[in-house]
Interface confidence: low
């Protein structure tokens, strides 16, 4: 997946830091105080639809076959710049009681972006 | 995730059968001859952005916090109807060396759709 560098407007991964205080979650998240969540942004022209960096999936490849042939209904389906690879991160937080939990939380960090 | 029923235009999962013959892959895929791949379609108005049925991820929850508060650059980010849960399927196929392989291929079937 591409890293956004300001030179291209093609689907890429943009760096973004989330502060848990900003979103009001510092009452239950002990550590970290924030993290680099990142996000996806950019255009998905038809020639790169279904390309998802190293996470190109079988499904998007198949659908793109139909899309590129103008097969209804795929010809009109918008291809979107979305996370194609997310990774977990370890967090220390209070659970539903007052127990302190250390756990790897899934889908926290965007690693790669691609066109759906 | 919603199943498309023709009554709503909100992001939902649409049934779709893929024929490997249709896309010219029947020369290397032995079995099955096709499968229900499904796909995602529908609108993602701002109030349902970041809702992905049972797969709502930590990341999309966080980003939606910023989006709903009109935080630049998220206010202008398009929310898209995309697969949020895919499952594998077993396939019998020829590899590059004409060996017959039986393997579970990841990300073949769309199980759930949601708004990114």
């Amino acid at each position: 997946g591409l890293e956004c560098d300001g030179k291209v407007n093609i689907c890429c991964k943009k760096q973004f830091f989330v502060s848990f205080k900003d979103i009001g979650w510092n009452d239950w998240i002990i550590a970290p105080s924030g993290y680099h969540a990142n996000y996806c942004e950019g255009e998905c022209p038809s020639h790169i639809a279904g390309t998802s960096g190293s996470s190109l999936s079988f499904h998007s490849t198949v659908i793109n076959h139909y899309r590129m042939r103008g097969h209804s209904p795929f010809a009109n389906l918008k291809s979107c710049c979305v996370p194609t690879k997310l990774r977990p991160m370890s967090m220390l937080y209070y659970d539903d009681g007052q127990n302190i939990i250390k756990k790897d939380i899934q889908n926290m960090i965007v690693e790669e972006c691609g066109c759906s | 995730g919603l199943e498309c029923d023709g009554k709503v235009n909100i992001c939902c999962k649409k049934q779709f059968f893929v024929s490997f013959k249709d896309i010219g892959w029947n020369d290397w895929i032995i079995a099955p001859s096709g499968y229900h791949a499904n796909y995602c379609e529908g609108e993602c108005p701002s109030h349902i952005a970041g809702t992905s049925g049972s797969s709502l991820s930590f990341h999309s929850t966080v980003i939606n916090h910023y989006r709903m508060r009109g935080h630049s650059p998220f206010a202008n980010l398009k929310s898209c109807c995309v697969p949020t849960k895919l499952r594998p399927m077993s396939m019998l196929y020829y590899d590059d060396g004409q060996n017959i392989i039986k393997k579970d291929i990841q990300n073949m079937i769309v199980e759930e759709c949601g708004c990114s």
Epitope: D27, Y94 | S54, S55
Partner: antibody
Framework: QVQLVQSGAEVKKPGSSVKVSCKAS????????ISWVRQAPGQGLEWMGY????????NYAQKFQGRVTITADESTSTAYMELSSLRSEDTAVYYC???????????????WGQGTLVTVSS | EIVLTQSPATLSLSPGERATLSCRAS??????LAWYQQKPGQAPRLLIY???NRATGIPARFSGSGSGTDFTLTISSLEPEDFAVYYC??????????FGGGTKVEIK
């Protein structure tokens, strides 16, 4: 101390709609998911859907999809549940409920409203 | 959607006795299961969350166990105030949340 205070009992005609409110006070944050759970007379508990007021994001149980609308007003810390096309089997006590933690890691319903009895009768 | 089946429907016991309530899920919910107590005319009260953790303020006589599809709520020695209806609820990570049909613990 968190308190969820619901609106009063309602009597409605079949085919009409009802809107129940739930006002949160004490240590509130709009990041908490407010759920609506109903209980028909002598029956069990049934989850209808939730809203995260911070987002306006609502998620509904398939059974109620298209008939229930959950909204929230962040400025007044109030959540609303509107159920339309009422029928006699919608006669129930409707509860709002909230976890201890903010979404998505707070999952179970620790705080409950007192319940609102909605009677559907012609 | 995951279906939770509680058994027995009714449990008739005397104060001081041990109560064992069961909740079975139609598919694995890992340890994402809670137990609630409800008395007539009152809202439910959270007793146990994540299968075995007692909620704040819940007496030690209440304990939960199990994972996957089979769960148990145990009340080691019934007090008069424990006679009520008990519900299990699953949250296998995200909604829809579902509840079991309930077990009524009544005085024998």
């Amino acid at each position: 101390q968190v308190q969820l205070v619901q609106s009063g009992a309602e009597v409605k005609k079949p085919g009409s709609s009802v809107k129940v409110s739930c006002k949160a006070s004490g240590g509130t944050s709009s990041s908490y998911a407010i759920s609506w759970v109903r209980q028909a007379p002598g029956q069990g508990l049934e989850w209808m859907g939730y809203i995260i007021p911070a987002f306006g994001t609502a998620n509904y149980a398939q059974k109620f999809q298209g008939r229930v609308t959950i909204t929230a007003d962040e400025s007044t810390s109030t959540a609303y549940m509107e159920l339309s096309s009422l029928r006699s089997e919608d006669t129930a006590v409707y509860y709002c409920a909230r976890p201890v933690r903010t979404y998505p890691l707070g999952k179970y319903f620790y705080h409950w409203g007192q319940g609102t009895l909605v009677t559907v009768s012609s | 959607e995951i279906v939770l089946t509680q058994s027995p429907a009714t449990l008739s016991l005397s104060p001081g006795e041990r109560a064992t309530l069961s909740c079975r899920a139609s598919q694995s919910v890992s340890s994402y299961l809670a137990w609630y107590q409800q008395k007539p005319g009152q809202a439910p009260r959270l007793l146990i969350y994540d299968a075995s953790n007692r909620a704040t303020g819940i007496p030690a006589r209440f304990s939960g166990s199990g994972s996957g599809t089979d769960f148990t709520l145990t009340i080691s020695s019934l007090e008069p105030e424990d006679f009520a209806v008990y519900y299990c609820q699953q949250d296998s990570i995200f909604p829809p949340y579902t509840f079991g049909g309930g077990t009524k613990v009544e005085i024998k």
